[in-house]
Structures are given as C-alpha cells and as structure tokens.
Interface confidence: low
C-alpha cells in the first residue's frame, strides 16, 4: 500500500475579515493510525490551531465528522477571521505512539490571507489657524486594512488635489497595513464653507470608498477690513462715527474706541451679520461730543480679531468749526476707505 500523503489542495485562501475560512486537508490513507493537528507556521515556534485528539478550540469546526472510522477529510473552518489570523496553516498527521504521538507527515501548507477593511479615514488639520494665501497641511490616516494595495485621493470641494504625499506602512509583509497621507492646501478668502476630503478605495470596500472630512472653517482665519466713517450729526455738538468691520472669520472679535489714544469704549462682536461666503460683518459706532473737546480729536477704531495683534483705523475730527451735514451716504453704501476731514 502506498504511503500516506497529506494533501492540502489550496496554496492560498483569501477571506474577508469577520468571515469563515475553510482550510482543506485530505489524507490519502487510513494508515498509520493517529490524529491530525493543524498548526499556523512551521518549526518550533508554530502555533497549535486544532488538535483532533484533545483540547478546546472554540473558533474551529471540522468540515466532516472526524469520529467516523474511515474519515480521511481533515478540513477545518475557522470562524470570525481577523487580520491576525493571516499566515500559513499546516495540516499535520501524527502516528500513534507511546507515550506521545509522533509527527508523521505534513501537508504543503495553505496561506491564509485576510481581506480587512480600512478604518474610517481621520482627517486632521493644522493646530493653529492660518490666513488666506497661506499653505496649510492636512493629514489623513486609515488603519487595519489588508491586502496592502490601496488608493487614497484628496479633494477640496469636489476638486481633486495633487499636492500630497502618501505612505503605506509597513513596507514589508504584514497582517494589516496603515496609510498616512499629507496634503497641502492653499487657503482663499472664500474657504470658510470649504471642505477637505480624504477618500480611500480598497478591494474590500466594493467600490464605495471611505471618506474623511475636515471643514476649513476650523482652519482658516480671515482678517477683517476696517472702515471708519463719520455719519450726519445727531445734534448741534454731537458727531456719530462708525467703524465697519467687514469680512472676518471666526466671529471672535473685540473692538476698542480710542479718543486721542485714550480708551473710550471696548465691546465684543455680538450681533454680527453673516455673508454668503461664511465671513461676518459687524458695525460699531461712537457718539462724540464735540463741545467737550477744545482741540482736534483723533478717533481710532482698534480691532483684536481671534487673539491676533490688533489692527486699527483712525479718523481725524476737527473741532475748529461746526460740523456740516453729510450727504445721504449711509454706512453700508460708503464702501471706500473714508479718512477725509469733513470740516
């Protein structure tokens, strides 16, 4: 009679994470008598996966009934596969011995590869806000996928970005992999509503890529433009001066009025109006009693936006003559930078 052979017909098996792997093994003879064991890996460090004779292996079931006398099918199923299960599995026939069974013959081995989905991409932006025209970096990370082949794309508002660098780790063989990508994005004043999207495509995702997003509203700072204008007089000796703070983001803003360098009033932006592009406008006004000043008055609107160094705009108020009525120009209509003396 021909000597027993252990046949593992599958060189490799590819299974999705969470599914069941079937590892096939057939013996060509019933002789010699003895149990079958399954191992992952070869050599002294191999890991016992299943022992026909004894032990408890909750994730492993046999394909056929190994208690039947004439059974020669030693295939097993391993449930709830994870990337950690990847490796080469050997079906090994033992010959009954005393006191211990002796290894008789091994199958050629079946390589189990696990297809694992990448984790949802996490996109993170810079720690500090940046202003328009500056280039900022965004990172995207996804982990735990297998096989290694993966595609990552960056988009800004649906437009694909080209300035990015991607690494997949580790470089060598591994049970699972991670991807890390850094994209450079140039900010514009219109980016408050913009989104940066990292898209990951992998064989396990069946054509539905995973996406991670970052809102540029978390990243951008649009500094305000200031305009100080003088409004028509309210009374014989009172002048109303407005400071228009336009197109700023985020909302955090503090405004201080200075009269000849002395603090007159400080206030925080509250009832702002929002522009279509997501930036804000705000207006503050100061009622100046001209009769209280003997000399010309320098009015300064000083704005501290989002913790940045203050910016200011000044307006000279001459008190040497009575103020004239201005035209019908309202603050909203006066779009130029009006620093003219109107006396």
């Amino acid at each position: 009679e021909e000597e027993l052979q252990v046949i593992q017909p599958d060189k490799s098996v590819l299974v999705a994470a969470g599914e069941t792997a079937t590892l096939r093994c057939t013996a060509t003879s019933l002789i010699p008598v003895g149990p079958i064991q399954w191992f992952r890996g070869a050599g002294p460090g191999r890991e016992l996966i299943y022992n026909q004779k004894e032990g408890h292996f909750p994730r492993v079931t046999t394909v056929s009934d190994l208690t039947k006398r004439n059974n020669m099918d030693f295939s097993i199923r391993i449930g709830n596969i994870t990337p950690a299960d990847a490796g080469t599995y050997y079906c090994v026939k033992f010959r009954k011995g005393s006191p211990d069974d002796v290894e008789f013959k091994s199958g050629a081995g079946t390589e189990l590869s696990v297809r694992a989905k990448p984790s949802a991409p996490v996109v993170s932006g810079p720690a500090a806000r940046a202003t328009p025209q500056h280039t900022v970096s965004f990172t995207c990370e996804s982990h735990g996928f297998s096989p290694r082949d993966i595609t990552l794309k960056w988009f800004k508002n649906g437009n694909e970005l080209s300035d990015f660098q991607t690494n997949v780790d580790p470089v060598g063989e591994s049970v699972s992999y991670s991807i890390h990508s850094t994209a450079k994005v140039v900010l514009t004043r219109e980016d408050v509503h913009s989104q940066v999207i990292c898209e990951v495509a992998h064989v396990t995702l069946q054509g539905d890529p995973l996406r991670g997003t970052a809102n540029l509203s978390e990243t951008i700072r649009v500094p305000p433009t200031l305009e100080v204008t003088q409004q028509p007089v309210r009374a014989e000796n009172q002048v109303n001066v407005t400071c228009q703070v336009r197109k700023f983001y985020p909302q955090r803003l503090q405004l201080t009025w200075l009269e000849n360098g002395n603090v007159s009033r400080t206030e925080t932006a509250s009832t702002v109006t929002e522009n279509k592009d997501g930036t804000y406008n705000w207006m503050s006004w100061l009622l100046v009693n001209v009769s209280a000043h003997r000399d010309d008055v320098k009015l300064t609107c000083q704005v501290e936006h989002d913790g940045q160094p203050a910016v200011s705009k000044s307006h000279d108020l001459k008190v040497s003559a009575h103020p004239k009525e201005q035209g019908s120009n309202t603050a909203a209509e006066n779009t130029g930078s009006n620093e003219r003396n109107i006396y």
């Epitope: 599958d10 490799s12 098996v13 590819l14 590869s113 082949d149 064989v203 995702l205 069946q206 054509g207």
Partner: antibody
Framework: DVQLVESGGGVVRPGESLRLSCEAS????????MTWVRQAPGEGLEWVST????????YYADSVKGRFTISRDNSKNSLYLQMNSLRADDTAIYYC????????????WGLGTLVTVSS | ALTQPASVSANLGGTVEITCSGG????YGWYQQKSPGSAPVTLI????NRPSNIPSRFSGSTSGSTTTLTITGVQAEDEAVYYC?????????FGAGTTLTVL
C-alpha cells in the same frame, strides 16, 4: 506599472487544442480575479471566462463551457486558458484582463494573442 | 444583453454622451478601443471610477439600469469604439460597441 503579457496563440485545425498563458507583473496577482476576453475579426468584445483570486471558482461563457478551462498559478503570477475542441468561431484575439473588485470590471488589459482555427 | 447606440458624433471640443442600458448589472464599466485588434483601455470601472492614467474629460454615471459615459471637451484622439460592460446572472457581458466620430 501593471503589465499583462499573453502568449500561446497560433493557427490550429478545428478539434485541436491550444493553451494560452498570461504573465502578470506590477501588482499583487493573488489578490485579484482574472479574466479572458476575446474579439473575433470585425466583431465586438466577448467575455470568455473568469477565475477567482484563489483559483477555486471559475466562470465560463456558454459558448465555451465544457471546452475551455481557466486556471492560475499564483506562485508564478500566471493565468492560463486551456482550449480544447476548438472551432472556427473561436478564432479571435484573446485578451487577458485584471479584474477590479467585482470580476466583471477590468482595469488593465494585455495586448492580446491571436488564435486562428482553420482547416 | 447591453444596448448601446451603434454610432455617435461630436464636435471637436464639444461634449458627447454615450448611454448603455439593459442587463441586470448593479455596476458597469466603459472601455475604449482605438482600432480593431488593439488592446482595449479601461476608461471607467465600477460606474464612476477612472484609472489614474485616464484624462478627467472622461466620466461615468449610472442611474438604475442605464449607465452613461460622458466626454467633455472631445479631442480628435477620442475617435474610437466605446464598449460598456457589466454582468448578467453571473456572466460577463459587453455592449456591441459605439463608434464615436469627431467632426
């Protein structure tokens, strides 16, 4: 770069056999389904056969079922098509194609090999 | 079977749409063949995915059982036969091909 190179084409008589090969490089061959597509002279593309990544499942067009056998050797990064009982209407250029996720989509194609069946 | 028009024409720089319908595919692909016997080139796979070497003027969309290949800014080199592909009860199928003529 992904490359698929077919070979094994030639002129045979009706009823004879031929074995086509496709050598793959530039990607992890064992992770992808592979397909044979053919194009008869003056005709459109016709799907012939597909094999799963592990090689344990094969699909065939009705026109070749029982005559053609698709196989692969992942250790050699190679795909094969054993064609038996060849007929005149099997005359075509045979392309090897790499499938992408679902086996009915192909993202890379070989240049093809011509099979002529003529008496 | 997948049904697509036998031929379409487009002006240089214009936009052209080629539709494909039928079969019971959930997803489709589009393939370009510039001359009979030359290797097909994948333009779109799985409805909307474009290989990295394919220009962005080619795009795909699918609604129900109809898939559409759109070429915006048609170039002279786009003159070719375009095949749609899908699956039907386990079999791979192709449309008969649409010849694009650039005017």
């Amino acid at each position: 770069d992904v490359q698929l190179v077919e070979s094994g084409g030639g002129v045979v008589r009706p009823g004879e056999s031929l074995r086509l090969s496709c050598e793959a490089s530039g990607f992890t061959f064992r992770n992808y389904y592979m397909t044979w597509v053919r194009q008869a002279p003056g005709e459109g593309l016709e799907w012939v056969s597909t094999i799963s990544d592990t090689g344990d499942t094969a699909y065939y067009a009705d026109s070749v079922k029982g005559r053609f056998t698709i196989s692969r050797d992942n250790s050699k990064n190679s795909l094969y098509l054993q064609m038996n009982s060849l007929r005149a209407d099997d005359t075509a250029i045979y392309y090897c194609a790499k499938s992408w996720i679902w086996w009915t989509f192909f993202d890379y194609w070989g240049l093809g090999t011509l099979v002529t069946v003529s008496s | 079977a997948l049904t697509q028009p036998a031929s379409v024409s487009a002006n240089l720089g214009g936009t052209v749409e080629i539709t494909c319908s039928g079969g019971n595919s959930n997803h489709y692909g589009w393939y370009q063949q510039k001359s009979p016997g030359s290797a097909p080139v994948t333009l779109i796979y799985a409805d909307t995915n474009r290989p990295s070497n394919i220009p962005s003027r080619f795009s795909g969309s699918t609604s129900g059982s109809t898939t559409t290949l759109t070429i915006t800014g048609v170039q002279a080199e786009d003159e070719a036969v375009y095949y749609c592909g899908g699956s039907s009860t386990g079999d791979g199928i192709f449309g008969a091909g649409t010849t694009l003529t650039v005017l």
